[in-house]
């Protein structure tokens, strides 16, 4: 069972990404990840989280925003935004620490 080692009861989440096996998944929490790769439009992925809850606490940057929630289908209608573009002298702060 691929979700056996998750903390606590499992929740059902909306799954919308190229790697989803169906419209929903089950995990320890629900996720929304907004990612903008260089030269591309931002893409929003919805799914399940089982590892590295610390990602949920990371600050949004101009490249990525992570959102997590803990109830049934709680990630279904969430829309995220990225931070405003940083000055060119600054590096993107993707390190969540």
């Amino acid at each position: 069972d691929p979700v056996k080692p998750s903390r606590g009861p499992l929740v059902t989440c909306t799954c919308e990404s190229p790697h989803c096996k169906g419209p929903t998944c089950r995990g320890a929490w629900c996720t929304v990840v907004l990612v903008r790769e260089e030269g591309r439009h931002p893409q929003e992925h919805r799914g399940c989280g089982n590892l590295h809850r610390e990602l949920c606490r990371g600050r949004p940057t101009e490249f990525v925003n992570h959102y997590c929630c803990d109830s049934h289908l709680c990630n279904h209608n969430v829309s995220l935004v990225l931070e405003a573009t940083q000055p060119p002298s600054e590096q993107p702060g993707t390190d969540g620490q």
């Epitope: 998750s6 990404s17 089982n50 590892l51 990602l55 490249f63 969540g96």
Partner: antibody
Framework: QVQLQESGPGLVKPSQTLSLTCTVS??????????WNWIRQHPGKGLEWIGY???????YYNPSLKSRVTISVDTSKNQFSLKLSSVTAADTAVYYC??????????WGQGTLVTVSS | EIVLTQSPGTLSLSPGERATLSCRAS???????LAWYQQKPGQAPRLLIY???SRATGIPDRFSGSGSGTDFTLTISRLEPEDFAVYYC?????????FGQGTRLEIK
């Protein structure tokens, strides 16, 4: 079958930057189920976790190395990379990349020895 | 930061005997994310056990894991010649990822 392969120089001069790349085959680095890690092992010693990157580009690093480490991902090439700056002889080690899932570090590269010497 | 301490440092046993390796955490941890690895000289570590007690794909059933809270155990019920190696426990799945210092299992 998922495979990971480390590549990069085997010899780095002191004070320079160590750069390694891990190429993933047989699976997508963009899957949200996985986290992509670097680990090292000094000669005759135990395993030391360096840090991980998620497909989104978010990173977490070992606090003892954080000031010198950068991990990046290139999803288009299915690769992730390690840079370790200001190296000294103490950074001589075998460097491994590994995939992390709910089932632990289930796939590892074979490891590459990096020697820091002038 | 949680520290994992493995004991003994070296374990000397003969083929056919039972091996019991210990991993103790400095504070209580989730048993969902405790793994064991085997490493032989010149090779990468190999995943044996994840989630404290689940065997990884292809791992013989003579390997078993147990424990909770702060105390975890890897048991090899009947040692085969190929089992003599170094074994590491690990906490994964949350920051920071940590490894124990290893137990060397050697032939007596």
């Amino acid at each position: 079958q998922v495979q990971l392969q480390e590549s990069g120089p085997g010899l780095v001069k002191p004070s320079q930057t160590l750069s390694l790349t891990c190429t993933v085959s047989g699976g997508s680095i963009s899957s949200g189920e996985y986290y992509w890690n670097w680990i090292r092992q000094h000669p005759g010693k135990g395993l030391e976790w360096i840090g991980y990157i998620y497909y989104s580009g978010s990173t977490y690093y070992n606090p003892s190395l954080k000031s010198r480490v950068t991990i990046s991902v290139d999803t288009s090439k299915n690769q992730f990379s390690l840079k370790l700056s200001s190296v000294t002889a103490a950074d001589t080690a075998v460097y491994y990349c590994a995939r992390e899932s709910v089932a632990g570090f289930d796939y590892w590269g074979q490891g590459t020895l990096v020697t820091v010497s002038s | 930061e949680i520290v994992l301490t493995q004991s003994p440092g070296t374990l000397s046993l003969s083929p056919g005997e039972r091996a019991t390796l210990s991993c103790r955490a400095s504070q209580s941890v989730s048993s969902s994310y405790l793994a064991w690895y085997q490493q032989k000289p010149g090779q990468a570590p190999r995943l044996l056990i994840y989630g404290t007690s689940s065997r990884a794909t292809g791992i013989p059933d003579r390997f078993s894991g147990s424990g909770s809270g702060t105390d975890f155990t890897l048991t090899i019920s009947r040692l085969e010649p190929e089992d003599f190696a170094v074994y590491y426990c690990q906490l994964y799945g949350s920051f920071p990822i940590t490894f124990g210092q290893g137990t060397r299992l050697e032939i007596k």
